[in-house]
Amino acid sequence: GITNINCSGHIWVEPATIFKMGMNISIYCQAAIKNCQPRKLHFYKNGIKERFQITRINKTTARLWYKNFLEPHASMYCTAECPKHFQETLICGKDISSGYPPDIPDEVTCVIYEYSGNMTCTWNAGKLTYIDTKYVVHVKSLETEEEQQYLTSSYINISTDSLQGGKKYLVWVQAANALGMEESKQLQIHLDDIVIPSAAVISRAETINATVPKTIIYWDSQTTIEKVSCEMRYKATTNQTWNVKEFDTNFTYVQQSEFYLEPNIKYVFQVRCQETGKRYWQPWSSLFFHKTPETVPQVTSKAFQHDTWNSGLTVASISTGHLTSDNRGDIG
């Protein structure tokens, strides 16, 4: 970087080399070159010579002034024009940065993905700081009062084996950079309440040729959690709004969900689950696409009243329309 060069003088920044974005700043350059009384002092930003807002302070020093500096990073260096030298002589260089102090971290969330062996904590860091910002995650046992701290630049994975202080913890996050420090509210967690079941996956679909063709979605999870609530959402790929259906699920067998779907339309499905009654959901599963078969022949009056509407239906992916839960309405 620019800071590794051999200097013949020095360069400094007021108020600091890291400063709040949008500030007015001054960059000073002082030459200390043997046998050189500089005729002129020049400033360069990212290799480009600056032509304005330069003031000569004395024989060896000049100032460059910037109003409302908005660049996150810049490399500055200055040079001197020395008598009897055909080219400018480098004085010194410095990297400068502008940014913001961190916002208060909020939406602190800690979850344990089933089988991961880790507690994953994330938070909303707020607006971009543009400068190096570190986060310290504090985990304090409510039973032993022991506190552990973890340094990170984004989220943190904490091995559940290291959580030896029982089941209840306080978690909070401190954010710090050169311009300031902020601390989140404390999140109280119980390890049993933050488990997210093993990912639910849509595996296949089939369409049954019936008076009203039904598409059956097959989906599963490797979870060992007994009581799981799931949502499946679906829509035509040309539409923006999703239909969402809810299920109480027992994953001791592959799930089958029925949809009534409009013909000749490409649909997309996703599923997600949570331990019933708990707070956190899985992320939505990867998109599963299916185009429904055509079932729109020109009908006669006879065909309309009977069941010759539907052309043969064979589907080997997935589709959507109406998902029906398994609550039966039969009498007897």
Epitope: T238, N243, Y260, T324, S325
Partner: antibody, heavy 117, light 106 residues
């Protein structure tokens, strides 16, 4: 040819439950299609309420989900609407209808229901 | 819920006149379905899958459209066409209807 006939009271008191029956002839409700209840309010607005399909599974309009139940008696080829905790807002003409993929191809004659004390 | 907006709410047409009514969905739908209802009668399926005429519907009727915007057209108005026409979508639950266009004979 499928035909749908409806029966049920014309007057129900507020907070009581409404029960309607749709009797289907010319087609077995277990053979296919889905069997719907819809209603039309005095201002002519139509609202789909829910269905029971040929397997006995239900789907309901979320606006009614906590109050509605659609069941069937396969031996009589009938399906039923029960709407709990009715208010004057539920005054409407209620229709049963056979559903296909997206639309309703056969409708019952309708039952006018008034909710009043 | 997808809101279906029909226009005009009421219209009148002379015998032989071409009639067009429209239905707009608040978000894109796959198909549109139309029903005809005469006073003191149940609605009847009239057009399904946007452009297919239900059995018994005269060929002077047609349906068209895509996305958010659909229409029902009568090429030449006849007296028996005076009725209220409702549009309906099945794309998103709950299935919803428009408020209707009442077509009167001038």
């Amino acid at each position: 040819e499928v035909q749908l006939q409806q029966s049920g009271p014309g007057l129900v008191k507020p907070s009581q439950s409404l029960s309607l029956t749709c009797s289907v002839t010319g087609y077995s409700i277990t053979s296919g299609y889905f069997w719907n209840w819809l209603r039309q309010f005095p201002g002519s607005k139509l609202e789909w309420m829910g269905f029971i399909d040929n397997d006995g599974s239900n789907d309901y309009n979320p606006s009614l989900k906590n109050r509605i139940s659609i069941t069937r008696d396969t031996s009589k080829n009938q399906f039923f609407l029960r709407l709990n905790s009715v208010t004057t807002e539920d005054t409407a003409t209620y229709y049963c209808a056979r559903g296909r993929l997206g639309f309703f191809d056969s409708w019952g004659p309708g039952t006018t229901l008034t909710v009043s004390s | 819920d997808i809101v279906m907006t029909q226009s005009p709410a009421i219209m009148s047409a002379s015998l032989g006149e071409k009639v067009t009514m429209s239905c707009r969905a608040s978000s894109s739908v796959n198909y549109m379905y139309w029903y005809q209802q005469k006073s003191d009668a149940s609605p009847k399926l009239w057009i399904y899958y946007t452009s297919n005429l239900a059995p018994g519907v005269p060929a002077r009727f047609s349906g068209s459209g895509s996305g958010n915007s659909y229409s029902l057209t009568i090429s030449s108005m006849e007296g028996e066409d005076a009725a209220t026409y409702y549009c309906q979508q099945f794309t998103n639950s709950p299935w919803t209807f428009g408020a209707g266009t009442k077509l009167e004979l001038k």
